[in-house]
């Protein structure tokens, strides 16, 4: 019961996390800026992974997509890649984990197969969460290192001047959504991996034969070699040795100095 609950909760937590990663990836508010030097109106600029928007206090808002791929900063491309990989892995993980759920019966799927699928989905969720956390962290680092800089003046070759606009760059809502979502996906993945241990069968299903010698002398029955190799008449794994040979199913054997395996 605890295993089912852990698996189910892990699935739900991962589902919420992946939904959050998708939301964060699509959001425009990855970085937000207040443009200080504008004497006209309060101008609020916010940017996402796919487009940049300008909003004015007058209510005017305009967004423009980054239509080029080659000209964009490498860091932005890296963040996009990490988030997309996170979403893809998470989606596959969700698909796998649906079939792995203990409460869902699909044909005669064994617990060992479900355990393997649970572990696979758990690992996928963990990697997915790590990708999202890494992507958001790389972007946050890019903001901190590249943009919290003092105003600098430069001169163009044409004689006109260009200066960086003094802006206050702040972390957008998408960064926090991404961090939380990545964390949830990671936690969900860990829960799935924990559930996998409970799903995995404790004992092996094959019948091992242990041979317990009752005395110091072991009587050898003819045909024993044939039986051990699977040839000859003794192919039913019959007891070959006299004196206490039992299958695991028949008796619990305790190790002694006279055990022969």
């Amino acid at each position: 019961m605890a295993v089912t609950a852990c698996q189910g909760l892990g699935f739900v937590v991962s589902l919420i996390g992946i939904a959050g990663i998708i939301a964060a990836t699509c959001m425009d508010q990855w970085s937000t800026q207040d443009l200080y030097n504008n004497p006209v109106t309060a101008v609020f600029n916010y940017q996402g992974l796919w487009r940049s928007c300008v909003r004015e206090s007058s209510g005017f808002t305009e967004c423009r997509g980054y239509f080029t791929l080659l000209g964009l900063p490498a860091m932005l491309q890296a963040v996009r890649a990490l988030m997309i990989v996170g979403i893809v892995l998470g989606a596959i993980g969700l698909l796998v984990s649906i079939f792995a759920l203990k409460c869902i019966r699909i044909g005669s799927m064994e617990d060992s197969a479900k355990a393997n699928m649970t572990l696979t989905s758990g690992i996928m969720f963990i990697v997915s969460g790590l990708c999202a956390i890494a992507g958001v962290s790389v972007f946050a680092n890019m903001l901190v290192t590249n943009f919290w800089m003092s105003t600098a003046n430069m001169y163009t070759g044409m004689g006109g001047m260009v200066q960086t606009v003094q802006t206050r760059y702040t972390f957008g809502a998408a960064l926090f959504v991404g961090w939380v979502a990545g964390g949830l996906t990671l936690i969900g993945g860990v829960m799935m991996c924990i559930a996998c241990r409970g799903l995995a069968p404790e004992e092996t299903n094959y019948k091992a034969v242990s041979y317990h010698a009752s005395g110091h002398s072991v009587a050898y029955k003819p045909g024993g070699f044939k039986a051990s190799t699977g040839f000859g008449s003794n192919t039913k794994n019959k007891k070959i040795y006299d004196g206490g040979a039992r299958t695991e199913d028949e008796v619990q054997s305790y190790p002694s100095k006279h055990d022969y395996v």
Epitope: S31, Q33, L35, N37, N38, V40, T41, V43, N45, Q47, S52, V54, E56, S58, G59, F60, E62, R64, Y66, T68, G71, L72, P73, L76, N146, F147, T156, G160, M161, V162, Q163, T164, V165, T167
Partner: nanobody, 122 residues
Framework: QVQLVESGGGLVQPGGSLRLSCAAS????????MGWYRQAPGKQRELVAV???????NYTDSVKGRFTISRDNAKNTVYLQMNSLKPEDTAVYYC????????????????WGQGTLVTVSS
């Protein structure tokens, strides 16, 4: 690279009119505010008029009611219609634009033109 090219300056009599235009070109991603500043001989550069992408305009007190700023977002161009010109309007008029570059859409830059001279004299 980005270029801001002003045109329309020249010599005009007091009470006359001039229309300045400034076209921005180059690897521009998005232009936010565009404006006009002026610098009279021996004085500091001052704001004349500025207009945001949404069309909100602001003017310095001395030109209110006489100057009109407008812009064409599609052409990345800003205009300054100057009416009832006075001798104290004589200055070099500079175009100014806050913009992003295509190569770096996360950073804002203020670009300036080289200026166009407006002389109001009889």
């Amino acid at each position: 690279q980005v270029q801001l090219v002003e045109s329309g300056g020249g010599l005009v009599q007091p009470g006359g009119s001039l229309r300045l235009s400034c076209a921005a070109s180059g690897s521009i991603f998005l232009i936010n505010a565009m404006g006009w500043y002026r610098q009279a001989p021996g004085k500091q550069r001052e704001l004349v008029a500025v207009i945001t992408r949404g069309g909100s305009a602001n003017y310095t007190d001395s030109v209110k009611g006489r100057f009109t700023i407008s812009r064409d977002n599609a052409k990345n161009t800003v205009y300054l219609q100057m009416n009832s010109l006075k001798p104290e309007d004589t200055a070099v008029y500079y175009c100014n634009a806050d913009l992003n570059l295509r190569s770096d859409p996360f950073k804002w830059y203020t670009f300036w033109g080289q200026g166009t001279l407006v002389t109001v004299s009889s």
